[in-house]
Interface confidence: low
């Protein structure tokens, strides 16, 4: 008996060949021999099976020998064995539909957990088999369950449904709800315009929810909110914000703020949190604002950098188109009675620099001895 | 065919940091999990982490957390295994292996010998 | 952690008998109707090689002497008839759970 797999929803062809290519007589019938369908002549004809309306022919492959019964908008239901009868054989195929879907919305928030349910008929004992877009494979029976989901799982599942040697493929897109980074620094020079950009990683027709950004200033003993938003249809409204920074905020996706100029007041990490409507739980990107500052008095010339830095980052002071006179891994650095021209301080990552200041020295009068 | 090619054997003091390479050929890189696993000598095999080369994302057994790093770099399909803090019975032979479906180890590198030796 | 438990340590067997290699898991490793235990054969100054996988699965290229059986806690590998070539240290191993995790090893020699 030959094993066919089916998806429940889609379309599936059983195939039955007489030994004779030419037409002939042929009926497709159930497991209770009700028929299904059959020919008379060159017409198709179907029998009381509940199958019948969505049972079909290709009629033009009928002269071939060819008689299969093409079935549409599969059901869990429609498997079991289907008898064809031509010449005189009967030849019999059965049909196990599998349905495979996740059990609540395709669209998830970062953390939650995927559970794919399988609907199979009875008596059949299916393993499922799925690998999720960034190659994890994952294997069960009844249930598949993905704990807990991050931004990389977003995208198509592919899925292996196999019985009795035999594989069906399901599709399963799934959206991750997500912004792009789970964490951003941005590096400025005192005074300069600082942008914090929050993409997402996902579109939505709609999008709606609200929004809030809470900052933890490096110096401050506590953090405090900055700005709420809202977000209705990809357009975003600010509800409040703070004075002192004075922050503007773009009216359109991805989600932008504008902080007029970077002081070291300001330098420490914020957490932007994102509630979208019908969902539970809150989408978050850390920010992280880091300053630096190059100042000369009297004949000290002093580097420093506020904000969140690792400790691995190096500080630098050097005279242009020299080697660096003082590097330390450490938020500030300074030279003594530097000479004159113009210097840079340079924070640095393994060699790459991520933020640099000039500053140029004057020279500073020696005091006359005595 | 599948291939993992991993770097020559290593010669370490205690407190130092070894870096091993796997570099993978013959498939598309970025779409199988690679775990690592040591056997010291005469000893068995213990699993110490695996990493997602497609996004970066690595997950380390409890016991090396804190000194083993996995990185990547899709440029070369090679996979990085940094072990710091490194002590006498650290020695033991460090394969790369591609997972099968779920944690089953199907394609294995040559394996890399790190001796760790005052 | 799930621990592997594999006996015998070592194991001597005449050239075409069967031999036969047990592992326990210190907790089931069964997940809705499969077993999540895979063995792994390895020659000196060689990696291991995948031989069974969930449970009874032959890896392909495996020769058909080679046979894997057992659920819940208690497996076992069996090789029917013990050819020259077979001669390693074979480990079982669970991957149901993170961290997978690994039995001690069984070293079949000829008898």
């Known amino acids: 008996k030959k094993v066919v797999l089916g998806k429940k929803g889609d379309t599936v062809e059983l195939t039955c060949n007489a030994s004779q290519k030419k037409s002939t007589q042929f009926h497709w019938k159930n497991s209770n021999q009700i028929k299904i369908l059959g020919n008379q002549g060159s017409f198709l004809t179907k029998g009381p099976s509940k199958l019948s309306d969505r049972a079909d022919s290709r009629k033009s492959l009928w002269d071939q020998g060819c008689f299969s019964m093409i079935i549409k908008n599969l059901k869990i239901e429609d498997s079991e064995t289907y008898i064809c009868e031509v010449e005189d054989k009967k030849e019999e195929v059965e049909l196990l539909v599998f349905g495979l879907t996740a059990n609540s919305d395709t669209h998830l928030l970062e953390g939650q957990s995927l559970t794919l349910t399988l609907e199979s008929p009875p008596g059949t004992s299916p393993s499922v088999k799925c690998r999720s877009p960034r190659g994890k494979n994952i294997q069960g029976g009844r249930t598949l369950s993905v704990p807990q989901l991050e931004r990389q799982d977003s995208g198509t599942w592919t899925c292996n449904v196999s019985q009795d040697q035999k594989t069906v493929e399901f599709k399963i897109d799934i959206v991750v709800l997500a912004f792009q980074k789970a964490s951003s620094t941005v590096y400025k020079k005192e005074g300069e315009q600082v942008e914090f950009s929050f993409p997402l990683a996902f579109t939505l027709e709609k999008l709606t929810g609200s929004g809030e950004l809470w900052w933890q200033a490096e110096r401050a003993s506590s953090s405090k909110s900055w700005i709420t938003f809202d977000l209705k249809n990809k357009e975003v409204s600010v509800k409040w914000v703070t004075q002192d920074p004075k922050l503007q905020m773009g009216k359109k996706l991805p989600l932008h703020l504008t902080l007029p100029q970077a002081l070291p007041q300001y330098a420490g990490s914020g957490n932007l949190t994102l509630a979208l409507e019908a969902k539970t739980g809150k989408l978050h990107q850390e920010v992280n604002l880091v300053v630096m500052r190059a100042t000369q008095f009297q004949e000290n010339l002093t580097c420093e950098v506020w904000g969140p830095t690792s400790p691995k980052l190096t500080l630098s002071l050097k005279l242009e188109n020299k080697k660096a006179t003082v590097s330390k891994q450490a938020k500030v650095v300074w030279v003594l009675n530097p000479e004159a021209g113009m210097w840079q301080c340079l924070l640095s990552d393994s060699g790459q620099v991520l933020l640099e200041s000039n500053i140029k020295v004057v020279p500073w009068p020696t005091p006359v001895q005595p | 065919q599948v291939q993992l090619v991993q770097s020559g054997a290593e010669v370490k003091k205690p407190g130092a940091s070894v870096k091993v390479s796997c570099k993978a050929s013959g498939y598309t890189f970025t779409a199988y999990v690679i775990s690592w696993v040591r056997q010291a000598p005469g000893q068995g095999l213990e699993w110490m982490g695996e990493i997602y080369p497609g996004s970066g994302s690595s997950y380390y057994n409890e016991k090396f957390k804190g000194r083993v790093t996995m990185t990547r770099d899709t440029s070369t399909s090679t996979v990085y295994m940094e072990l710091s803090s490194l002590r006498s019975e650290d020695t033991a032979v460090y394969y790369c292996?591609?997972?099968?479906?779920?944690?089953?180890?199907?394609?294995w590198g040559q394996g890399t010998l790190v001796t760790v030796s005052s | 952690d799930i621990v592997m438990t594999q006996s015998p340590d070592s194991l001597a067997v005449s050239l075409g008998e069967r031999a036969t290699i047990n592992c326990k898991a210190s907790q089931s490793v069964d997940y809705d109707g499969d077993s999540y235990m895979n063995w792994y054969q390895q020659k000196p100054g060689q990696p291991p090689k995948l031989l069974i996988y969930?449970?009874?699965n032959l890896e392909s290229g495996v020769p058909d002497r080679f046979s894997g059986s057992g659920s819940g806690t208690d497996f076992t590998l069996t090789i029917s008839s013990l050819q020259a070539e077979d001669v390693a240290v074979y480990y079982c191993q669970q991957s149901l759970q993170d961290p997978p995790t690994f039995g001690g090893g069984t070293k079949v020699e000829i008898k």
């Open positions: 292996a591609r997972s099968g479906d779920g944690s089953r180890f199907v394609y």
């Open positions: 969930v449970a009874s």
